[in-house]
């Protein structure tokens, strides 16, 4: 882990970022508040039955930036939204599923006869 | 440099309540949230809150929930914890302090005392 | 909530003996995050704490290096490696992991 002076550590936050969370609070949370020295974020994805799941919680400032840029995964419909301008600011965060595209359901399992 | 300021103190009657100050100056008042603890003589320090400036966040101690309440003016940059109910158990040195991720800078303390 | 347990309650030595503190929690302090927010204070009679230490190990700003912090996870240790008169009055660990964030009952350090 990255000291806090070293150079190629992200820009560390002046203070810490309380977060709501949801399916997704640490041990450290306290009445579905977490804290935070990167980012809330708001996410949806589909699980395995195809309904989907919004989960929301705290981000470390760690590999924070990666996450939140929502690069699309293959064959997973998923995504993500990322503040820091206020505390709580996820509650407000709300991310839609990526459209279905047809190649979805073309690159699922084939069954032979 | 940072300084926070707080009045000495403060004589109040039981059963009133009491609006307790602390002026920042030295640092941007809004990068930090501010904190309140409690000392009271060989009873140690306790965490009573803590408010974001940027947006008025409050996070309490749930023994302090009905007991605080904290506030901020960002534009004297000056935080206030005002006491309700007071009684004798309320005698006791408050202090405001900056927060980061930890207490980097304290007030000289408000000694509140509690008495008809 | 986080209970800190420090000990001793009464530390004496002579000027210029190493002291040790310790201070124990009764949960890991290792945040979420990865960061463990434990921090020292030194509080000298009529005067508010002063910050020492941070997250278990980092010296803050114009504190001599005879201070150091050291621990991992629930067992911390603040040392002086040769006691000045100016170090005398008492020591509090702090743990910002969990809220509500607590503090130890404190550790004077006096003349033997």
């Known amino acids: 882990k990255k000291e806090d002076g070293e150079s190629t550590a992200p820009t560390p936050r002046p203070k810490v970022l309380r977060c709501k969370c949801h399916h997704h609070c640490p041990e450290d949370s306290v009445n579905n508040i977490c804290s935070t020295d990167g980012y809330c974020f708001t996410m949806i994805e589909e699980d395995d039955s195809g309904l989907p799941v919004v989960t929301s919680g705290c981000l470390g400032l760690e590999g924070s930036d990666f996450q939140c840029r929502d690069t699309p995964i293959p064959h997973q419909r998923r995504s993500i939204e990322c503040c820091t301008e206020r505390n709580e600011c996820n509650k407000d965060l709300h991310p839609t599923l990526p459209p279905l595209k047809n190649r979805d359901f073309v690159d699922g399992p084939i069954h032979h006869r | 440099q940072v300084q926070l300021q707080q009045p000495g103190a403060e004589l109040v009657k039981p059963g009133a309540s009491v609006k307790l100050s602390c002026k920042a100056s030295?640092?941007?008042?809004?990068?930090?949230?501010m904190q309140w603890v409690k000392q009271r003589p060989g009873q140690g320090l306790e965490w009573i809150g803590e408010?974001?400036?940027?947006?008025?966040?409050?996070l309490y101690n749930q023994k302090f929930k009905d007991k605080a309440t904290l506030t901020v003016d960002t534009s004297s940059s000056t935080a206030y914890m005002q006491l309700s109910s007071l009684t004798s158990e309320d005698s006791a040195v408050y202090y405001c302090a900056r927060f980061g991720y930890y207490v980097d800078y304290w007030g000289q303390g408000t000694t509140l005392t509690v008495s008809s | 909530d986080a209970v800190m347990t420090q000990s001793p309650l009464s530390l004496p030595v002579s000027l210029g003996d190493q002291a040790s503190i310790s201070c124990r929690s009764s949960?890991?302090?290792?945040?979420?995050?990865?960061?463990?927010?434990l921090h020292w204070y030194l509080q000298k009679p009529g005067q508010s704490p002063k910050l020492l230490i941070y997250k278990v190990s980092n010296r803050f700003s114009g504190v001599p290096d005879r201070f150091s912090g050291s621990g991992s996870g629930t067992d911390f240790t603040l040392k002086i490696s040769r006691v000045e008169a100016e170090d005398l009055g008492v020591y509090f660990c702090?743990?910002?992991?969990?809220?509500?964030?607590?503090f130890g009952s404190g550790t004077k350090l006096e003349i033997k």
């Open positions: 949960q890991s302090l290792v945040h979420s995050t990865g960061n463990t927010y």
């Open positions: 702090s743990q910002t992991t969990h809220v509500p964030f607590t």
């Open positions: 408010i974001d400036p940027s947006d008025r966040y409050t």
């Open positions: 030295g640092y941007t008042f809004t990068n930090y949230w």
